[in-house]
């Protein structure tokens, strides 16, 4: 048995931030689980981890320098990524492992979400030209 995961095919981060919702075919209520978000076709970079526990509040962390937060729904985990860079435009995959109670369950690999990070326009505006040399 595998958990199925649904993600948006594409998201655009206009302000260098994005909410990526991972929707599962499984109710996470009263379970102990590890949800994670992975970057790249090979899922090589673990962007963010959310540990859920029936008795404690959510633990959210990144060991790879991403600014992330997480929110739990009954059948979803939403990752909120901030301070993204244009060169972090990539495909991102949701992953879930349910540890307790047994049996252990994980997910079928999802189709992923392409996150397109649109850079802030840093060019000077024509109305306010930058300083010029005399």
């Amino acid at each position: 048995n595998k958990i199925l995961v649904k993600q948006s095919p594409m998201l655009v981060a206009y302000d260098n931030a994005v909410n990526l919702s991972c929707k599962y075919s499984y109710n996470l209520f009263s379970r102990e689980f590890r949800a994670s978000l992975h970057k790249g076709l090979d899922s090589a970079v673990e962007v963010c981890v959310v540990y859920g526990n029936y008795s404690q509040q959510l633990q959210v962390y990144s060991k790879t320098g991403f600014n992330c937060d997480g929110k739990l729904g009954n059948e979803s985990v939403t990752f909120y990524l901030q301070n993204l860079y244009v060169n972090q435009t990539d495909i991102y995959f949701c992953k879930i492992e349910v540890m307790y109670p047994p049996p252990y369950l994980d997910n079928e690999k999802s189709n992923g979400t392409i996150i397109h990070v649109k850079g802030k326009h840093l060019c000077p505006s024509p109305l306010f030209p930058g300083p010029s040399k005399p």
Partner: antibody, heavy 120, light 111 residues
């Protein structure tokens, strides 16, 4: 045949660290269906669960030891490791690794254990 | 954490006796009709050995004189006719929640 063999025990100074190994044979640590836990037993006392590692590499630790313990593995050697830091006298125990299947999480195979003594 | 309390802590019995050990959990260890409660036997200087898993299933190779019963919070290990090789310490263990916990043990001694 499934086998687990622990090694690395011995005398350790208080405040020091230990790194124990558990060599697995008869199954792969990185294929689905099974995980491995570390369990310890102080002399004349009961059994205490330390933590576990799943085939995915994800780990879970006992809250009472979480700040001092790391479980890792080397897939190429099919070997599991336990690192325990800031050792104290009460960490003196026989340390076991034990396999569990993903259906019920019962420990169906155990190693023979390795004794760690923390003393100056 | 889920606490497991075994009783008695020790008992003296003779070969051929029927022996019963109980294990009480501080909360239910049942999920979807399965009890995540297991029993182990340990002899001095040896690693524990799995006897019963999921409250009542006999592990392969374990003699049929061992049986387990119970659900929810109350569980029993029964040895129908004690044999000389059964003198050992017995532990219950739950795998319903992390951290996994063990009972304090019941030592079965020769009368």
């Amino acid at each position: 045949e499934v086998q687990l063999v622990e090694s690395g025990g011995g005398l350790v100074q208080p405040g020091g660290s230990l790194r124990l190994s558990c060599a697995a044979s008869g199954f792969s640590l990185s294929t689905g269906g099974v995980g491995v836990s570390w369990i310890r037993q102080a002399p004349g006392k009961g059994l205490e669960w330390i933590g576990e590692i799943y085939h995915s590499g994800s780990t879970y630790y006992s809250p009472s030891l979480k700040s001092r313990v790391t479980i890792s593995r080397d897939n190429s050697k099919n070997t599991l490791y336990l690192q325990l830091n800031s050792l104290r006298a009460e960490d003196t125990a026989v340390y076991y690794c034990a396999r569990y299947e993903y259906d019920y999480y019962d420990f169906d195979y155990w190693g023979q254990g390795t004794l760690v003594t923390v003393s100056s | 954490d889920i606490q497991l309390t075994q009783s008695p802590s020790s008992l003296s019995a003779s070969v051929g006796d029927r022996v019963t050990i109980t294990c009480r959990a501080s909360q239910s260890v049942d999920f979807h009709g399965i009890s995540f409660l297991h029993w182990y036997q340990q002899k001095p200087g040896k690693a524990p050995k799995l006897l019963i898993y999921a409250a009542s299933s006999l592990q392969s190779g374990v003699p049929s004189r061992f049986s387990g019963s119970g659900s929810g919070t109350d569980f029993t290990l029964t040895i129908s006719s004690l044999q000389p090789e059964d003198f050992a310490t017995y532990y219950c263990q739950q795998s319903y929640r992390s951290p996994r916990t063990f009972g304090q043990g019941t030592k079965v001694e020769i009368k």
